[in-house]
């Protein structure tokens, strides 16, 4: 049943909005949708949630939401912001997620998320991002998802990452990334989850990847890569890769030799005419291995240490013979 | 604890080849860099070359291109320098380093003394 | 090959005081904003030891009376209160490109 409290709560509930108790005395307040031009101004300050996306906001005061100081969850997304100002989430001391894609930012509000210290998730992607600023982050000490998808990045904004040392997962998908270079994500010690797929990336630095010492899950798949990405060999817990949809000719000799853990590679969509005879050599998590018209292979691939492979799919090779081993190699 | 563990002082002549070993423990081996660096008697320091262990993946200083080759062994998470056609000039403390946070050499080991002496 | 160059090369600095060693490297040794110089500190017949990384981060451990500053071509190391057991050489070193090159060192000494 409901408390004394939660119908005072109610009570504070914007016109048009859809308002209910969150189970801790405070308050989730829904107005999506609802053709709104500016925020509410009769919000309760006992809100925890806060859903504002898909109206027609163009712009945030200073200062908009005061004294909500128990807010957890603001949502901007889907309006028509094309900048933010410094003290936009004054006050704001618990938020911790953060959602302003598919606005029409063009650069990283930086003044305005300066201080935002509980900040766990924040959301730009589908915005018009094409610089982010090297201090944008640096208040963000929380920060554990990050959104930046889908903007107009050319780079990796190298030095704005180095203050995230607590981020678990990042996409830069979708975006206009032309290399990566040499500690591009060297801070980033916790990073398990990196997206970097439909850029144009065509070349990796050989450093590229050091530093991402928890990465789990790597993501490349539809760049310009002509070379096989060599730098992912310090990835020491990757269990899931992708770069298919390349322009990868070779897998070269021990070509996962840093990647024990690895569970499954998608590697499909490459004009890969060669692989090493060690390429897939102890990957004992290994399940799937699609090798189709890699025409220079001639030797069957050398699966030691690969023992748990539960298909494997070769075709167009020009191989003549399997080795007498080859049953032991597998299950 | 990491830590990096290298082998003992070798004397050689001029003209021979050294091994250098560097035992490494308390990380994993295959995720950074080691880097090898030289230290003349009263000198500076002077960077060889550097490996990622269990690949192939090398880099000389073009200086001792020639007669340098750094390998690993991940059974034993050593890494090995040998130095050929040695000279008296390469009379050096040789160090082994891990290269950490973006490349720098963040633990050494002890140094292994070479003495090249007719 | 990047020539780094220290100054000075040696220094006498009474207990408490400030020392500050300069490096200059011949060429830029920023990349995407990123100063890719170190510094570390060696004592008599010891390894050296990381202090500095990226020009002014403070290697973990490394007391807080050591800092770094500078950016592309001209770094400094500054020890606010010189402590006796600072006494040490100080070498600079870069990464931004092979052949990886060290400073020829600045020796501290207590005046």
């Known amino acids: 049943g409901s408390s004394p409290r939660s119908g005072v709560l109610l009570r504070g509930c914007p016109t048009h909005c859809h308002c209910e108790p969150d189970g801790r005395m405070l308050l989730r307040v829904d107005c999506s949708d609802l053709g709104l031009s500016e925020l509410p101004s009769n919000l309760s300050v006992f809100t925890s949630y806060l859903d504002l996306s898909m109206n027609n906001i163009s712009q945030l005061l200073p200062n908009p939401l005061p004294s909500l100081r128990f807010l957890e969850e603001l949502r901007l997304a889907g309006n028509a912001l094309t900048y933010i100002p410094k003290g936009a989430f004054t006050g704001l001391y618990s938020l911790k997620v953060l959602m302003l894609q598919n606005n029409q930012l063009r650069h990283v509000p930086t003044e305005a998320l300066q201080n935002l210290r509980s900040l766990q998730s924040l959301r730009l992607d589908a915005n018009h991002i094409s610089y982010v600023p090297p201090s944008c982050f640096s208040g963000l000490h929380s920060l554990r998802h990050l959104w930046l998808d889908d903007n107009a990045l050319t780079e990796i904004p190298v030095q704005a990452f180095r203050s995230l040392s607590a981020l678990q997962a990042m996409t830069l998908a979708l975006n206009k990334i032309h290399h990566i270079p040499d500690y591009a994500f060297g801070n980033l010690s916790s990073l398990v989850v990196l997206h970097l797929h439909n850029n144009r990336i065509h070349s990796l630095g050989k450093k590229c990847f050091d530093g991402l010492h928890s990465l789990e899950t790597l993501d490349l798949n539809y760049n310009n890569l002509d070379e096989f990405p060599t730098a992912i060999r310090t990835l020491s817990n990757l269990k899931e890769l992708g770069f298919h949809s390349n322009n990868i000719r070779s897998i070269p000799e021990k070509a996962f030799v840093g990647n024990p853990s690895l569970i499954t590679i998608h590697f499909y969509d490459n004009p890969i005419q060669f692989v090493g005879r060690s390429a897939f050599q102890h990957l004992p998590e290994l399940r799937t291995l699609t090798l189709n018209g890699a025409s220079q292979i001639t030797e069957f691939p050398d699966l030691t240490g690969t023992a748990n492979l539960e298909s494997l799919t070769l075709t167009g090779a020009q191989i003549s013979s399997l080795p007498q081993t080859v049953c032991n190699q597998l299950p | 604890e990491v830590q990096l563990v290298q082998s003992g002082a070798e004397v050689k002549k001029p003209g021979a080849s050294v091994k250098v070993s560097c035992k490494a423990s308390g990380y994993t081996f295959s995720a950074y860099w080691i880097e090898w660096v030289r230290q003349a008697p009263g000198q500076g320091l002077e960077w060889i070359g550097e490996?990622?262990?269990?690949?192939?993946?090398?880099d000389y200083n073009e200086k001792f291109k020639v007669r340098v080759t750094i390998t690993s062994d991940t059974s034993t998470s050593t890494v090995y320098l040998e130095l050929s056609s040695l000279r008296s000039e390469d009379t050096a403390v040789y160090y082994c380093a891990r290269g950490g946070h973006y490349g720098s050499l963040d633990y050494w080991g002890q140094g292994t003394l070479v003495t090249v002496s007719s | 090959d990047i020539v780094m160059t220290q100054s000075p090369d040696s220094l006498a600095v009474s207990l408490g005081e400030r020392a500050t060693i300069n490096c200059r490297a011949s060429?830029?040794?920023?990349?995407?904003?990123?100063?890719?110089m170190h510094w570390y500190q060696q004592k008599p017949g010891q390894p050296p030891k990381l202090l500095i990384y990226l020009a002014s981060n403070l290697e973990s451990g490394v007391p807080d009376r050591f800092s770094g500053s500078g950016s592309r071509t001209d770094f400094t190391l500054t020890i606010s209160s010189l402590q006796a057991e600072d006494v040490a050489v100080y070498y600079c070193q870069q990464n931004y490109e092979d052949p990886f090159t060290f400073g020829q060192g600045t020796k501290v000494e207590i005046k």
């Open positions: 060429e830029s040794v920023d990349n995407y904003g990123n100063s890719f």
């Open positions: 490996i990622l262990p269990g690949s192939d993946s090398t």
